[in-house]
Structures are given as structure tokens and as C-alpha cells.
Amino acid sequence: LCQGSNYSTCASCPSCPDRWMKYGNHCYYFSVEEKDWNSSLEFCLARDSHLLVITDNQEMSLLQVFLSEAFCWIGLRNNSGWRWEDGSPLNFSRISSNSFVQTCGAINKNGLQASSCEVPLHWVCKKCPFADQALF
């Protein structure tokens, strides 16, 4: 049930790897260290996951419970419009850039924030349990 295209969703899946948190049908990894956006993306990909792509406001609200004031990288970038790493547009929340270098997206308990991709931040990975192909 968890197999399929890269951007499908998980259904009822086994438990998550160590240091990953199971929430709903996905596993989430909240980093302790900090990296820039690209390095955070690489970290997630190396673990058969992806930087967090949030599917709707409900998921965002639930995840924010686990967040603090500190911003975390998520799979959101501004390439001629804010888009998630799965290619879908950001359409359930708002994010605005204050400068031309703020092309990567981050989240904290208060919401989304545009940032320069070079800033070292915590990050959140998301995947189906046990490295199934369905990442989002």
C-alpha cells in the first residue's frame, strides 16, 4: 500500500525508524543540528525521504505543535512562485519575501517564513515508514 509513485501518500504503514516520529501515515525527522537548505535536502534524500512537503493546513497545524520559535527548513522554494518540492503550488498558506535572496521556505510554531537558502537552520524530513517510495 505504501509503494507507488514518488509523490503519493502513505496509507496504513509500519512504524518509523529510530529518531523518526510517526504522525498519521508518515514519518517525520526533526533535526538537532543545523544546515543550509541544500544540505538539508541532501540529508533527507540520503535517507530515502524528502524535505517536508505539507499537504494542507491541517497537517501544518499538527506539525506546528512540535515546533518552537526556531525555524526549520521545509521543501518549499520560490521558483517563479512558491512551490513545494513535489511541484505543487503553495495554496493553503501565505509566505512573503522581504528581499530577492529569500527563495527558500522555513516553518516555526507561528507559521511560514521566507529565508535566504544559505542560512543554517534545523530541518524536517518526511517519508513513508521503512523507506517506501511514497515520500509525500
Epitope: N98, S99, F100, V101, Q102, S116, V119, P120
Partner: antibody
Framework: EVQLVESGGGLVKPGGSLRLSCAAS????????MSWVRQAPGKGLEWVAT????????YYPDSVKGRFTISRDNAKNTLYLQMSSLRAEDTAVYYC?????????????WGQGTLVTVSS | DIQMTQSPSSLSASVGDRVTITCRAS??????LAWYQQKPGKAPKFLIH???TLAEGVPSRFSGSGSGTDFTLTISSLQPEDFATYYC?????????FGQGTKLEIK
């Protein structure tokens, strides 16, 4: 407390060169874009240069492009401005400035400035 | 390049007065505007970003408004320490241009 201390200003002849330094303390230097802003005597503020966190991207207005080079040493918490082919119109107080964080490119913190005089 | 034009270039007012300084952009800059205060012989001090958001520690008598091309900085009740020169600045893209300044003097 954020502190930015500029040095290296002085009198230089037209066509000459000068290197300004800005020592940063009180914050994690390697998390912020940094800039230079200048002010000619009795005049307004003019943005001179901005450098990204890693130093890989630099930005200049046309008035100094090709003559000024901004750089940084994150290990030493120091920002630099190498100025060459100096002209009389480059005479100004040069301020080092830090952005607001996350790439918010307003100038949230300023040094006290260092005076550069270009004159024969 | 975007040009920033401030008015008036100088202004005389008294302690307790309400003062408004205007900054106009040559094209739409949305809310990408900052304000600074500078006293003679001193470095500028950051007051406001994104047209209306007060910097930490800035007194609430300062406020910013506007979007698009027309912006204002308002001081609701002038204090002696507010007499200075004020600059607006476009902060979204290159070049980061400043207004020419407005000098606020004691009447």
C-alpha cells in the same frame, strides 16, 4: 550586544587603493549577509556592497562595480572592502552594516564608520 | 533602477507635534521599505522595515504606513531626541536605494 567596528580609513590619492575592515562581535557572523554603506560629507546614504553568508554572492551598484570588492572571513568574524581606482567622489564615511536575519536585507545594525578621503 | 524621493527635504517642528515624512518610489515596491534615523556625527539607526514593522526597541510614537509607491513615517508626539535626519530605503532588490533624507529641526 551586536558590535561592528570599522577600520582602515584614511587619506589616499586619486587612483589609489585602500582596504577597509569591519570586526564583528556579539552575534554569529556566519549566519548573516553583510554590507557596506557610505555617506559623503554633508550628503545622504549610498549603498556600496553586499555579500552573502558564504561569500559566494556579491552585489554592487554601478557606481563602484569593477573597482570595489567586498569579501569576508567567517573564521575571523571580519568583513572587508577592497577599494581601487579611487576617485574624489569616493570620499565618504564608510559604514559596515548587518542585515536583519534570514536574508532580510535592511540594515539592522551599523558600525560607527571610518572616513576615507580621496585627495591629491 | 528604483528611485526614492523624500519630502519635505527639511521640516521645522516643536516638541509634542505630530510629524509626517513622505517617501515615494519611482515604481511599485509593495512593502519593501525601511526607515532610518541619523543624528549628526553618528551612524544611522534602524527604525522600521516592511513599511510598517517597528524594529526592536523603537518607541511606539514612531509608525510607518503605505504600500506600492507612497509611504509615510509618522512621529505622533515629537520628543527632543527625535530631531534628526530620516532616510527611507528600498530593501527588496538591487540596488538598495535610499531617499535623499529629511532633516527634522526644532522650530
Amino acid at each position: 550586544e551586536v558590535q561592528l567596528v570599522e577600520s582602515g580609513g584614511g587619506l589616499v590619492k586619486p587612483g589609489g587603493s585602500l582596504r577597509l575592515s569591519c570586526a564583528a562581535s556579539g552575534f554569529t557572523f556566519s549566519r548573516y549577509y553583510m554590507s557596506w554603506v557610505r555617506q559623503a560629507p554633508g550628503k545622504g546614504l549610498e549603498w556600496v556592497a553586499t555579500i552573502s553568508i558564504s561569500g559566494g554572492n556579491t552585489y554592487y551598484p554601478d557606481s563602484v562595480k569593477g573597482r570595489f570588492t567586498i569579501s569576508r572571513d567567517n573564521a575571523k568574524n571580519t568583513l572587508y572592502l577592497q577599494m581601487s581606482s579611487l576617485r574624489a567622489e569616493d570620499t565618504a564615511v564608510y559604514y559596515c552594516a548587518r542585515e536583519g536575519g534570514y536574508g532580510n536585507l535592511w540594515f539592522a545594525y551599523w558600525g560607527q564608520g571610518t572616513l576615507v578621503t580621496v585627495s591629491s | 533602477d528604483i528611485q526614492m524621493t523624500q519630502s519635505p527635504s527639511s521640516l521645522s517642528a516643536s516638541v509634542g507635534d505630530r510629524v509626517t515624512i513622505t517617501c515615494r518610489a519611482s515604481e511599485n515596491i509593495y512593502s519593501a521599505l525601511a526607515w532610518y534615523q541619523q543624528k549628526p556625527g553618528k551612524a544611522p539607526k534602524f527604525l522600521i522595515h516592511s513599511a510598517k514593522t517597528l524594529a526592536e526597541g523603537v518607541p511606539s510614537r514612531f509608525s510607518g504606513s503605505g504600500s506600492g509607491t507612497d509611504f509615510t513615517l509618522t512621529i505622533s508626539s515629537l520628543q527632543p531626541e527625535d530631531f534628526a535626519t530620516y532616510y527611507c530605503q528600498y530593501h527588496y532588490g538591487i540596488p538598495f536605494t535610499f531617499g535623499q533624507g529629511t532633516k527634522l529641526e526644532i522650530k
